[in-house]
């Protein structure tokens, strides 16, 4: 029961996540102008990984796509190719976890074979919140960078009577949202991994018992019956935990992230 | 088609109060940032108040800051300016105008004459 | 604030001449977020409210007529008639729209020589 409780939960806070992280890649607001100790603008200023946007207090917004490839920064790119990373793992782990859940039958699947599904969705859901939370990370990191540089260059240039104000660029809430839904990933895949300990399936191994009847010896070996029958005084439960092996080859085998740039 | 009509304007003493309201129709009301610009006799045109379309934040000039209240009724489609402190520079048409893309103001009203005088 | 300068203050073109009005900011209205200027020009004559004319600097209003443009970047702007009509006469006012407060340029009168 605490298994099945401890998958399903896991499952749940995987796809909460993973939605996150959907949510989070399509969201413009992943910078946003900093407006502390700036000049009132009628405009304001936010970008995302795929276009940027600005509001004028008109009512008015308009957004423009980064319609170049190449001419993008490399950083941007990497972050782009984090995201989608970390959503097809993510997509992929889903899909393989509905057919792990212990409450759903499918045919006459072995535990087992739920069991290394389980194993095998928690892993992607780790790296699927660990690609999130790095993509997440790394256009943060960029930020400051950026922000400090447009600091220092916010009173320089110009000169004279004429002044050009710098834009300068903050956390957006994509951020935040992402940073939370790679970090639900991460424990959904974490959640996963255990209950896959518990989903092994339990196997009786039981020596031989023999029985002496009246001038012949017939020897039954019940071994192979799941449940304990109360064979002898010698019952040996043994928990069998098939999986892990595999795994890292299934993960590996996922298309790698050039592959959705 | 886009309706601005400005009304009460009048004759006010220096220190008075006066409420201007625009009526507004043949848009969503509620979208758009509306301004106030005023012009005054034989003079130029000054901006007065703005109150952003959506998140309705209110902008003003110095010269009217503390004095003059820019809000709007959005059931009512109504745009109002109340103005206390009164001064004779405060005379002028007053014109109600919706805002569009580059904070532009496309549309305009016929405007609304107050008069600052003891 | 944001010093709206219009030159000259009064400008006499003879019909069919083409008519330039500059407009100078103390502060660039470039905004980076979209490289786009915040600068209109409006038309108004007597006894009327402003008409838009330009916005962004350099973006005709519908229904504006094609001999009115737009041109400039940062801190100066200019608005130029191509071939004067009659009905142009009216005084012409430049504005930021990027810093509040806005602020209009004093105007220019442009009349028939």
């Known amino acids: 029961m605490a298994v099945t409780a401890c998958q399903g939960l896991g499952f749940v806070v995987s796809l909460i996540g993973i939605a996150g992280i959907i949510a989070a890649t399509c969201m413009d607001q992943w910078s946003t102008q900093d407006l502390y100790n700036n000049p009132v603008t009628a405009v304001f200023n936010y970008q995302g990984l795929w276009r940027s946007c600005v509001r004028e207090s008109s009512g008015f917004t308009e957004c423009r796509g980064y319609f170049t490839l190449l001419g993008l920064p490399a950083m941007l790119q990497a972050v782009r190719a984090l995201m989608i990373v970390g959503i097809v793992l993510g997509a992929i782990g889903l899909l393989v976890s509905i057919f792990a859940l212990k409450c759903i039958r499918i045919g006459s699947m072995e535990d087992s074979a739920k069991a290394n599904m389980t194993l095998t969705s928690g892993i992607m859901f780790i790296v699927s919140g660990l690609c999130a939370i790095a993509g997440v990370s790394v256009f943060a990191n960029m930020l400051v960078t950026n922000f400090w540089m447009s600091t220092a260059n916010m009173y320089t240039g110009m000169g004279g009577m004429v002044q050009t104000v710098q834009t300068r660029y903050t956390f957006g809430a994509a951020l935040f949202v992402g940073w939370v839904a790679g970090g639900l990933t991460l424990i959904g895949g974490v959640m996963m991994c255990i209950a896959c300990r518990g989903l092994a399936p339990e196997e009786t191994n039981y020596k031989a018992v023999s029985y002496h009847a009246s001038g012949h010896s017939v020897a039954y070996k019940p071994g192979g019956f799941k449940a304990s029958t109360g064979f002898g005084s010698n019952t040996k439960n043994k928990k069998i935990y098939d999986g892990g092996a595999r795994t890292e080859d299934e993960v590996q085998s996922y298309p790698s992230k050039h592959d959705y740039v | 088609e886009v309706q601005l009509v400005e009304s009460g304007g009048g004759l006010v003493k220096p220190g008075g109060s006066l409420r201007l309201s625009c009526a507004a129709s043949g848009f969503t009301f509620s979208s758009y940032g509306m301004s106030w610009v005023r012009q005054a006799p034989g003079k130029g045109l000054e901006w007065v108040s703005t109150i952003s379309g959506g998140d309705s934040y209110t902008y003003y000039p110095d010269s009217v800051k503390g004095r003059f209240t820019i809000s709007r009724d959005i059931a009512k489609n109504s745009l109002y300016l109340q103005m206390n402190s009164l001064r004779a520079e405060d005379t002028a048409v007053y014109y109600c105008a919706r805002s569009y893309n580059a904070n532009s103001l496309p549309y305009w009203g016929q405007g609304t004459l107050v008069t600052v005088s003891s | 604030d944001i010093v709206m300068t219009q030159s000259p203050d009064s400008l006499a073109v003879s019909l069919g001449e083409r008519a330039t009005i500059n407009c100078k900011s103390s502060?660039?209205?470039?905004?980076?977020?979209?490289?786009?200027?915040?600068l209109t020009w409006y038309q108004q004559k007597p006894g009327q409210p402003p008409k838009l004319l330009i916005y962004w600097a350099s973006t005709r209003e519908s229904g504006v007529p094609d001999r009115f443009s737009g041109s400039g970047s940062g801190t100066d702007f200019t608005l130029t008639i191509s071939s004067l009509q009659a009905e142009d006469v009216a005084v012409y006012y430049c504005?930021?729209?990027?810093?509040?407060?806005?602020?209009f340029g004093q105007g220019t009168k442009l009349e028939i020589k």
């Open positions: 504005q930021n729209n990027y810093f509040y407060p806005f602020t």
């Open positions: 502060q660039s209205l470039l905004n980076s977020g979209n490289q786009r200027n915040y």
